[in-house]
Amino acid sequence: MLRLLLALNLFPSIQVTGNKILVKQSPMLVAYDNAVNLSCKYSYNLFSREFRASLHKGLDSAVEVCVVYGNYSQQLQVYSKTGFNCDGKLGNESVTFYLQNLYVNQTDIYFCKIEVMYPPPYLDNEKSNGTIIHVKGKHLCPSPLFPGPSKPFWVLVVVGGVLACYSLLVTVAFIIFWVRSKRSRLLHSDYMNMTPRRPGPTRKHYQPYAPPRDFAAYRS
């Protein structure tokens, strides 16, 4: 997270260079329930244009998260070729991407991109500052399709239960065996009539000291 915030400083504030479309995005969004609405606002009216609006993940924009393809006379086409669950909505100077089922590890910086294909000339945007999407999901792992604890959780519970029962049985059996063998040893012992002596001091076993972990050092 900290790295992303630092990386944002690498991008200067938006300036116009030639015939470029300017893009405005929220600096940061938090996805509490694994879903988020990211609005890309353009300095351009898209309504009478054939355009391709896309959302890219990562500082290098390597992952194309979602694409909204629009043509003034046709219905909006929204798709993702990278497995994201996304939808899109068009305003006259904006495209809103609705991302769902986000995972915690998809916390990253996301960039809006716009390309006007028709009529010419071809236009695209000046790179925006991006939006950090911080996914605060309910699940640490990829979220299951159904609510409640996942299958691996139940498997662990069952396996854990079986192992616990097994170890309990083994322990009980061992104790019974040990008590019986001790009793039989006492009955046949040559030292039965000796007076007992006080034993010497027993060695105490201390838990070795483990310094507390500096969790702050692990935060990113």
């Epitope: 009216n45 244009r49 006259n92 006007v116 010419p120 000339p121």
Partner: antibody
Framework: KVQLQQSGAGLVKPGASVKLSCKAS????????INWVKQRSGQGLEWIGW????????NYNEKFKDKATLTADKSSSTVYMDLSRLTSEDSAVYFC??????????????WGQGTTLTVSS | DIQMTQSPASLSVSVGETVTITCRTS??????LAWYQQKQGKSPQLLVY???KLADGVPSRFSGSGSGTQYSLRINSLQPEDFGSYYC?????????FGGGTKLEIK
């Protein structure tokens, strides 16, 4: 200063062809669409089509598809319109106009002075 | 193709008056509309684009309004140089059709 200079008036015979020119100056020629507009005497304006010098792409009004042919010469920053099989219906003033994209809203911001075409035997 | 219905076709008014010219489109053009003024024997000149935005150098007595399929051009306190013909034009997909025009004459 942006200017669109059109070729002079012409008198042509029915059935013949004519080539009208529109020379652009004062801006980057390949960055803007050039349109052609027809206006018959005392009538309104009719959009014929556009030519984009940057890629050579063309868009015609269906009504003029078999009548007009748009071309360009980048070296002289000139767009041409060929009108074929001329009839008296083609007698009109023809304007070229530059299309400006203002943040996704279009307009014809600069116009040529017009070329008067008279088709008569 | 989108049909453009401009009204009135002609208008006879006096200097100082206010006039409104309307343009109706056959479908929603989302404000992709321009207005032009043309004087006799001259080329058209851009007045308004994006339905409401005034082009550079156009006097503030001119104003554009409207949305959807209804648009209008208003000229406050008409000046002698305002007389001529006015045309609307849509840019919602080609062909970029013009309205039939409104001829503004001095009364």
């Amino acid at each position: 200063k942006v200017q669109l200079q059109q070729s002079g008036a012409g008198l042509v015979k029915p059935g013949a062809s004519v080539k009208l020119s529109c020379k652009a100056s004062g801006y980057t020629f390949s960055d803007y669409i050039i349109n052609w507009v027809k206006q018959r005497s005392g009538q309104g304006l009719e959009w014929i089509g556009w030519f984009y010098p940057g890629s050579g792409s063309i868009n015609y009004n269906e009504k003029f598809k078999d009548k007009a042919t748009l071309t360009a010469d980048k070296s002289s920053s000139t767009v041409y319109m060929d009108l074929s099989r001329l009839t008296s219906e083609d007698s009109a003033v023809y304007f070229c106009a530059r299309r400006e994209d203002r943040g996704g809203y279009d307009a014809f911001d600069y116009w040529g002075q017009g070329t008067t075409l008279t088709v008569s035997s | 193709d989108i049909q453009m219905t401009q009204s009135p076709a002609s208008l006879s008014v006096s200097v100082g008056e206010t006039v409104t010219i309307t343009c109706r489109t056959s479908e929603n053009i989302y404000s992709n509309l321009a207005w032009y003024q043309q004087k006799q024997g001259k080329s058209p000149q851009l007045l308004v684009y994006a339905a409401t935005k005034l082009a550079d150098g156009v006097p503030s007595r001119f104003s554009g309004s409207g949305s959807g399929t209804q648009y209008s051009l208003r000229i406050n306190s008409l000046q002698p140089e305002d007389f001529g013909s006015y045309y609307c034009q849509h840019f919602w997909g080609t062909p970029w059709t013009f309205g039939g025009g409104t001829k503004l004459e001095i009364k």
